[in-house]
């Protein structure tokens, strides 16, 4: 069942979003979400994952980015990007000349 | 609500220093406290950043070996201590805040959620 919480060993990780209370959290394993809202610029938050371990192996897109990894502080120096969006009119692989 | 306030400038000689804090209320925890400051009829410039999580600090290239910040943990207050002032540092200084860090975007204004209300930095020849 992917929304039961694991109960395996814990670990520490960096956190860094509008929901840490501290540098550091400790969680079944360590996230780093990037996500570009509507009208904003892209936000990378970084914190421990308990639950919807299924969302780790989600492939990016043009608006979400999502890592997971299971050592000591292992998303501390994790930068990702999001899937860049091809112009309709343009193919992959061309320099638009 | 969160407030920041900055403190320490004033009038100093070229050459001097000066030594510029930053208080946060109303939250316990930033991931990100930097710097920037704004020259009369000019942008506003990134000065530094401290990541709080490791305490490494961040900084313009052209500030780098002048300036220092660092942070005091248990009174969620970061400072700004510059050394060999020159006239072109004249500037308000303003204290960020944000509730996360970026590689990418650290040195930018638009990731930073709060702001103080900026302390004056005068120096004069």
């Known amino acids: 069942d992917p929304v039961k919480p694991s109960r395996g060993p814990l670990v520490t990780c960096t956190c860094e979003s509008p929901h840490c209370k501290g540098p550091t959290c400790r969680g079944a394993w360590c996230t780093v979400v990037l996500v570009r809202e509507e009208g904003r610029h892209p936000q990378e938050h970084r914190g421990c994952g308990n639950l919807h371990r299924e969302l780790c192996r989600g492939r990016p897109t043009e608006f979400v980015n999502h890592y997971c990894c299971d050592s000591h502080l292992c998303n501390h120096n994790v930068s990702l990007v999001l899937e860049a969006t091809q112009p309709p009119s343009e193919q992959p692989g061309t320099d638009g000349q | 609500q969160v407030q920041l306030v900055e403190s320490g400038g004033g009038l100093v000689q070229a050459g001097g220093s000066l030594r510029l804090s930053c208080a946060a209320s109303?939250?316990?925890?930033?991931?990100?406290m930097g710097w920037f400051r704004q020259a009369p009829g000019k942008e506003r410039d990134f000065v530094g950043a401290?990541?709080?999580?490791?305490?490494?600090?961040y900084y313009a290239d052209s500030m780098k070996g002048r300036f220092t910040i660092s942070r005091d943990n248990a009174k969620s207050t970061v400072f700004l201590q510059m050394n060999s002032l020159r006239p072109d540092d004249t500037a308000v200084y303003y204290c960020?805040?944000?509730?996360?860090?970026?590689?990418?975007?650290?040195?930018?204004?638009?990731?930073?959620?709060?702001w103080g209300q900026g302390t004056q930095v005068t120096v004069s020849s």
């Open positions: 109303g939250r316990t925890f930033f991931a990100t």
């Open positions: 960020a805040a944000s509730t996360y860090f970026s590689f990418t975007t650290y040195y930018t204004a638009r990731m930073y959620d709060y």
């Open positions: 401290i990541r709080w999580s490791d305490g490494v600090a």
